[in-house]
């Protein structure tokens, strides 16, 4: 249904303040260095020009596409070229090729500072003082820092974070309130934004047919009861919103998610019988919920996918007919009966399954050569079974910390030429999945351990995108998307590998060590490991652990020493000299 | 299962030398940290020297620095104190300990394997 004007119906549908929200979240991901009061000045004009709009659609330039409007905002920033370089030249082009060129120009690790948190009491004042500048600057600073964070639930964050601020600032003790609420706030917001930026590679790097195979595959085991003709409609819709939303155009896909919502609440029968506590929240709340909603239970005396897709005689005649609503019908068969299996399993099955018939539907006896298709699922399965059970073991052993360094010292020795704090920051993240996944019963695993280390390794994936370096990484990255974890798995020391140059300063602490919150340390003597096993990719073990364990008592010692900043040169000569002599560095 | 035995200890005067042994069986000895820890009666188990994996890193408490060096030999599964200039506080019974897998460096909990000590008692 067309409109007359873009801006004015997304502006009507959305209401003022979540428009204003969405050109702000817009803009900040993609001009990610300009000043906040840059951001709000342009936000502002965008919003009034939309007020005319809507008083009158035939009003000038009310016709234009939002990308018009929007892109010929951004590149009216004075100082584009000089803080943006390259990017200005987007400017020159016309649409749709000027939107392209800001997407290909959205920068994953953007150069900008660690976000402090100030003191509660400083907070409070600023957040009474001006809500509303207070709760913008949170979306601006998210934004910038996340560009592919998925809008229309930043907006859901922001509401969380002013409700946090309402209900703590008049506590009796505000820190103990909260501290742990933006604690939590945090902690889900780099997974929704890890999790989001996963499916915008699947969209961008894969293609739509990739996205919608996952979604078929998600959604089926989330709605086992819902028909196939259903799941396929959510499917269409979903990769539509997420398409936007990836594309920039984040009105229409805030838009369109609302819409999805209110669709899947309206037809709940024939969907789950598991959303009915979501569809009574508010739209944002519903959203969320509808998105995190657990499996429905599968429905009883499913009959065995073998009739269908093994020995019926017409199995190369329906594939033939239309080969993706087939393998989708066997995508969403299998998927419904395995909430046990991890997405990313169920769609390497789909893909054996297909490169079978295609070889099998050629030969002269097909039935005979896809017989015992489903033979070749068994290592499929099995492979990531033993994986998860094998780390879990060696979590249950070691604990969080030390599970993450002996995947530090895994991963370094795999792929050394990636960048130190890259390899920090994923390590530690494959580490968590120990203590995500390893307290799930057997039939949780999986699904939680194989399709979150698919999350972490994209991450992977789109740092060492801006600055590629290793050919190893390239590959398990770009070959096959839902083998990527299995490619990376399979790696083993890069025997190619000039071990890294010896440079003292890499390992020179000093008294601010002490003062550090636990984590902050801990990334420090996780910076450490990653180097020493760049300079000695040949140290086995044992030696790492051992120097690890002199670089903690050096620490110790000298957080406890009275001149700690002498404490930490002289000590820390004699600890690089010592390691230097032990492994030969 | 670790084994570690001390041996060395006696009774000696004030300003004299003893040397203190302490021989490992068990698990590999040169993957792990030594530490050298002491109570005298009445007090708590405190520690005296930590030696590091290779032998190329030790670090001592205030009280011995200057007069205690700590050694060992990966080849003999061994590990060694030498105190000199002993005064009558350091009598002691004197315990060897294998560094644990957590826990602090000089604390008793964040050793695993324990000796079964050797007294040196210092007369004045």
């Known amino acids: 249904d067309a409109h007359k004007s873009e801006v004015a119906h997304r502006f009507k549908d959305l209401g003022e303040e979540n428009f204003k929200a969405l050109v702000l979240i817009a803009f900040a991901q993609y001009l990610q260095q300009c000043p906040f009061e840059d951001h709000v000045k342009l936000v502002n004009e965008v919003t009034e020009f939309a007020k005319t709009c809507v008083a009158d659609e035939s009003a000038e330039n009310c016709d234009k596409s939002l990308h018009t409007l929007f892109g010929d905002k951004l590149c009216t920033v004075a100082t584009l070229r000089e803080t943006y370089g390259e990017m200005a030249d987007c400017c020159a082009k016309q649409e749709p090729e000027r939107n392209e060129c800001f997407l290909q120009h959205k920068d994953d690790n953007p150069n900008l500072p660690r976000l402090v948190r100030p003191e509660v009491d400083v907070m409070c004042t600023a957040f009474h003082d001006n809500e509303e500048t207070f709760l913008k600057k949170y979306l601006y600073e998210i934004a910038r820092r996340h560009p592919y964070f998925y809008a229309p639930e930043l907006l859901f964050f922001a509401k969380r974070y002013k409700a946090a601020f309402t209900e703590c600032c008049q506590a009796a003790d505000k820190a103990a309130c909260l501290l742990p609420k933006l604690d939590e706030l945090r902690d889900e917001g780099k997974a929704s934004s890890a999790k989001q930026r996963l499916k915008c590679a699947s969209l961008q790097k894969f293609g739509e047919r990739a996205f919608k195979a996952w979604a078929v595959a998600r959604l089926s085991q989330r709605f086992p009861k819902a028909e196939f003709a259903e799941v396929s409609k959510l499917v269409t819709d979903l990769t539509k919103v997420h398409t936007e939303c990836c594309h920039g155009d984040l009105l229409e896909c805030a838009d369109d998610r609302a819409d999805l919502a209110k669709y899947i609440c309206e037809n709940q029968d024939s969907i789950s019988s598991k959303l009915k506590e979501c569809c009574e929240k508010p739209l944002l709340e519903k959203s969320h919920c509808i998105a995190e909603v657990e499996n429905d239970e599968m429905p009883a005396d499913l009959p065995s996918l073998a009739a269908d897709f093994v020995e019926s005689k017409d199995v190369c005649k329906n594939y033939a007919e239309a080969k993706d609503v087939f393998l989708g019908m066997f995508l969403y068969e299998y998927a419904r009966r395995h909430p046990d299996y991890s997405v990313v399993l169920l769609l390497r099955l789909a893909k054996t399954y297909e490169t079978t018939l295609e070889k099998c539907c050629a030969a002269a006896d097909p039935h005979e050569c896809y017989a015992k298709v489903f033979d070749e699922f068994k290592p499929l399965v099995e492979e990531p079974q033993n994986l998860i059970k094998q780390n879990c073991e060696l979590f249950e052993q070691l604990g969080e910390y030390k599970f993450q360094n002996a995947l530090l010292v895994r991963y370094t020795k795999k792929v050394p030429q990636v960048s130190t704090p890259t390899l920090v920051e994923v390590s530690r993240n494959l580490g968590k999945v120990g203590s995500k996944c390893c307290k799930h019963p057997e039939a949780k695993r999986m699904p939680c351990a194989e399709d979150y280390l698919s999350v972490v390794l994209n991450q992977l994936c789109v740092l060492h995108e801006k600055t590629p370096v290793s050919d190893r990484v390239t590959k398990c990255c770009t070959e096959s998307l839902v083998n990527r974890r299995p490619c990376f798995s399979a790696l083993e020391v890069d025997e190619t590998y000039v071990p890294k140059e010896f440079n003292a300063e890499t390992f020179t602490f000093h008294a601010d060590i002490c003062t550090l919150s636990e984590k902050e340390r801990q990334i420090k003597k996780q910076t450490a490991l990653v180097e020493l096993v760049k300079h000695k990719p040949k140290a086995t073990k044992e030696q790492l652990k051992a120097v690890m364990d002199d670089f903690a008592a050096f620490v110790e010692k000298c957080c406890k020493a009275d001149d700690k900043e002498t404490c930490f040169a002289e000590e820390g000569k004699k600890l690089v000299a010592a390691s230097q002599a032990a492994l030969g560095l | 299962q670790v084994q570690l035995v001390e041996s060395g200890g006696g009774l000696v005067q004030a300003g004299d030398s003893l040397r203190l042994s302490c021989a490992a069986s068990?698990?590999?000895?040169?993957?792990?940290?030594m530490g050298w820890f002491r109570q005298a009666p009445g007090k708590e188990r405190e520690f005296v020297a930590r030696?590091?994996?290779?032998?190329?890193?030790?670090y001592y408490a205030d009280s011995v620095k200057g007069r205690f060096t700590g050694s060992r030999d990966n080849a003999k599964n061994t590990v060694y104190l030498q105190m000199n200039s002993l005064k009558p506080e350091d009598t002691a019974v004197y315990y060897c300990?294998?560094?644990?897998?957590?826990?602090?460096?000089?604390?008793?909990?964040?050793?695993?394997?324990w000796g079964q000590g050797t007294q040196v008692t210092v007369s004045s």
């Open positions: 300990a294998q560094r644990g897998d957590s826990g602090s460096n000089y604390d008793p909990s964040g050793y695993s394997y």
């Open positions: 068990g698990r590999t000895f040169s993957d792990y940290a």
């Open positions: 030696i590091n994996w290779s032998g190329t890193l030790t």
